[in-house]
């Protein structure tokens, strides 16, 4: 099966790489604009230059193109704890990230929030914190993992999943209660 091509892709595929078909005259192939520029005017004829202009401040194009407007630079989301890693240039969008000892949690494909890496108090680091993943902790005896924190088994309710992990401790507590002094 032939994959379905969009109109723009169909038009571009008629011309060699780095060129696009003139929108008003499909016998003319115009040279695409370099990254950092956008299309101001199509080339007037074969072998003639495309009129490309540099993107204005606050906008960019990251690859060769025949866009009529540059793309707006992204802004890092302070409300998500994001910080600017590198600022926007005419040929590259803003790069946003997190501070040291934080990781990115993606709520959706294009939205992430920065959270502090877990320190594994009352446990040990099983896997170190990474750019897109929190530390993986292993808890010491007498503690269980809840939302990536090691919590004392004394906070384990019978109905919760922790009962399996805390079973020896729970039995010990029962044992102490049951053993009367004779």
């Amino acid at each position: 099966l032939v994959p379905h091509l969009g109109d723009r892709e169909k038009r571009d595929s008629v011309c060699p790489q780095g060129k696009y078909i003139h929108p008003q005259n499909n016998s003319i192939c115009c040279t695409k604009c370099h990254k950092g520029t956008y299309l101001y005017n199509d080339c007037p004829g074969p072998g003639q230059d495309t009129d490309c202009r540099e993107c204005e401040s606050g906008s960019f194009t990251a690859s060769e193109n025949h866009l009529r407007h540059c793309l707006s630079c992204s802004k890092c989301r302070k409300e998500m704890g994001q910080v600017e890693i590198s600022s926007c240039t005419v040929d590259r969008d803003t790069v946003c990230g997190c501070r040291k000892n934080q990781y990115r949690h993606y709520w959706s494909e294009n939205l992430f929030q920065c959270f502090n890496c877990s320190l594994c108090l009352n446990g040990t680091v099983h896997l170190s914190c990474q750019e897109k993943q929190n530390t993986v902790c292993t808890c010491h005896a007498g503690f269980f993992l809840r939302e990536n924190e090691c919590v004392s088994c004394s906070n384990c309710k019978k109905s919760l999943e922790c009962t399996k992990l805390c079973l020896p401790q729970i039995e010990n507590v029962k044992g102490t209660e049951d053993s009367g002094t004779t």
């Epitope: 989301r77 302070k78 409300e79 998500m80 949690h105 709520w107 929030q113 959270f115 502090n116 929190n134 939302e147 990536n148």
Partner: nanobody, 119 residues
């Protein structure tokens, strides 16, 4: 005690509009970023839109961009979601919540309000 109470859901025809409200109490509303999430039948939670504590910074999922508008009234401790040009795929239970601070889970959220888009 933190309480979040959503309202404004209902049955609406495709192309119609609804305005959801979320009344908040038990915390300092104006110091919290707020979010609307939704859960369609048999699907996971989807982050729909959020608004910063200042009311200026907003975000919309691609699926609702240009159709939904989030806003807040800090004097009334209320969060809103204006939903226009509704589609069948917007059918879901809508919840409001605080933007989490400590980790990627919601500390508090309401009982939700059901939005059904059907002809």
């Amino acid at each position: 005690e933190v309480q979040l109470l959503e309202s404004g859901g209902g049955l609406v025809q495709p192309g119609g509009s609804l305005r959801l409200s979320c009344a908040a109490s038990g915390f300092t509303f104006e110091h919290e970023g707020m979010v609307w999430v939704r859960q369609a039948p048999g699907k996971g939670l989807e982050w729909v839109s959020h608004i910063g504590e200042d009311g200026q910074s907003t975000y919309y999922a691609d699926s609702v961009k240009g159709r939904f508008t989030i806003s807040r009234d800090n004097s009334r401790n209320t969060l809103y979601l204006q939903m226009n040009s509704l589609r069948a795929e917007d059918t879901a239970v809508y919840y409001c919540a605080n933007i989490p601070k400590a980790g990627p889970s919601f500390d508090y959220w309401g009982q939700g309000t059901l939005v059904t888009v059907s002809s």
